[in-house]
């Protein structure tokens, strides 16, 4: 049974040209996190954090994505095209897969950055189904 909950930074905004931290946190489960995938709104992968092997930043984002803090991701040199949904996918054993959603709005104006931290519903599957493409699961 999947008991975990994903907490994310929720809906956040940041200035064009600035940077933002995308954070997810898995709680209420003893499951072992084997890998976290960070994915963009168009289903392109930004980064992988493998528990054993460390980080891999995908080449399309190599100049403006930095790993961390923690299992989070720092997105730099923001453009208006970065506005949209971001997903963290936690692969865990024995629970299976948990997924969190963050919505980032990149602002032209000098509106101050803010973040609303809140709990979102989890989306989970049995571990045996991990062959499925996780990016087929939408909110």
């Amino acid at each position: 049974m999947m008991t975990g909950t994903i907490e994310t930074t929720g809906n956040i905004s940041a200035k064009k040209g600035g940077s933002v931290i995308l954070q997810c946190h898995l709680s209420s489960t003893m499951a072992q996190v084997t890998q976290v995938n960070w994915e963009q709104h168009d289903h392109s992968l930004l980064a992988i954090r493998n528990a054993e092997l460390g980080w891999h930043i995908y080449p399309a984002f190599k100049d403006r994505v930095a790993p961390g803090p923690g299992l989070g991701l720092t997105l730099q040199s923001l453009t208006m095209n970065d506005t949209g949904e971001y997903f963290c996918t936690y692969h865990t054993y024995p629970d299976g897969t948990y997924r969190g959603r963050i919505f980032l709005e990149v602002l032209e104006s000098s509106v101050a950055e803010h973040s609303a931290r809140f709990q979102i519903p989890i989306e989970g599957r049995d571990y045996k189904d991990d062959d499925d493409k996780h990016h087929h699961h939408h909110h």
């Epitope: 992968l45 092997l53 460390g54 190599k62």
Partner: antibody, heavy 121, light 106 residues
């Protein structure tokens, strides 16, 4: 120590099939993205295709010359990578090597010696 | 299909720096890797993710990648560096090798 050992090569007639295997050891195979690369006699390196880890969908990508004829699969429980080659052509003659895609700093292992596939009538 | 172009051959004197280039459309948006292959041997990865060196590869090997060109530089080239060098463009959907450059140490 990271080790990759390919097997299954041999002589096959045009239009025939062959299945290559790659036995991996010394690392957690299930974490790795794995590719097949080939080298025809006296020629350069040519990427054949790859399979991603299951935590990245387990999806496959292929080079245009082999798409629709070759299939890459993996058995993480056996630490083994496979290349099923169908409708073989003479131009598929090459040494076939399995390789670890260089995603991670601590997993950039050596290549195996490869296995020779000869397609000839 | 995506293509990478390498010069067929490069010559260098011992102790000098050798530069081997690889060009491809928007190559800087992908990761460039470099492989060294000596006669009768399997290729060895010498640079990955543009500029990273695997453990065991000497510091004289370095790499860069921007725009349409990736460059492998060998500073203080030694006779043992004579080999074929292949560039590779790597991203999450495809992988392509260049045609290879034969490095001759005069």
């Amino acid at each position: 120590e990271v080790q990759l050992v390919e097997s299954g090569g041999g002589l096959v007639k045009p239009g025939g099939s062959l299945r290559l295997s790659c036995a991996a050891s010394g690392f957690t195979f299930s974490n790795a993205w794995m590719s097949w690369v080939r080298q025809a006699p006296g020629k350069g390196l040519e990427w054949v295709g790859r399979i991603k880890s299951k935590t990245n969908g387990g999806t496959t990508d292929y080079a245009a010359p082999v798409k629709g004829r070759f299939t890459i699969s993996r058995d993480d429980s056996k630490n083994t990578l496979y290349l099923q080659m169908n409708s073989l052509k003479t131009e598929d003659t090459a040494v076939y090597c399995c390789t670890i895609d260089p995603l991670y700093d601590i997993l950039t292992g050596p290549w195996g010696q490869g296995t020779l596939v000869t397609v000839s009538s | 299909p995506y293509e990478l172009t390498q010069a067929p051959s490069v010559s260098v004197s011992p102790g000098q720096a050798a530069s081997i280039t690889c060009s491809g459309d928007k190559l800087g948006d992908k990761y460039a890797c470099w492989y060294q292959q000596k006669p009768g041997q399997s290729p060895v990865l010498v640079i990955y993710q543009d500029s990273k060196r695997p453990s065991g590869i000497p510091e004289r090997f370095s790499g860069s990648n921007s725009g349409n060109t990736a460059t492998l530089t060998i500073s203080g080239t030694q006779a043992m560096d004579e080999a074929d060098y292949y560039c590779q463009a790597w991203d999450s959907s495809t992988v392509v090798f260049g045609g290879g450059t034969k490095l001759t140490v005069l």
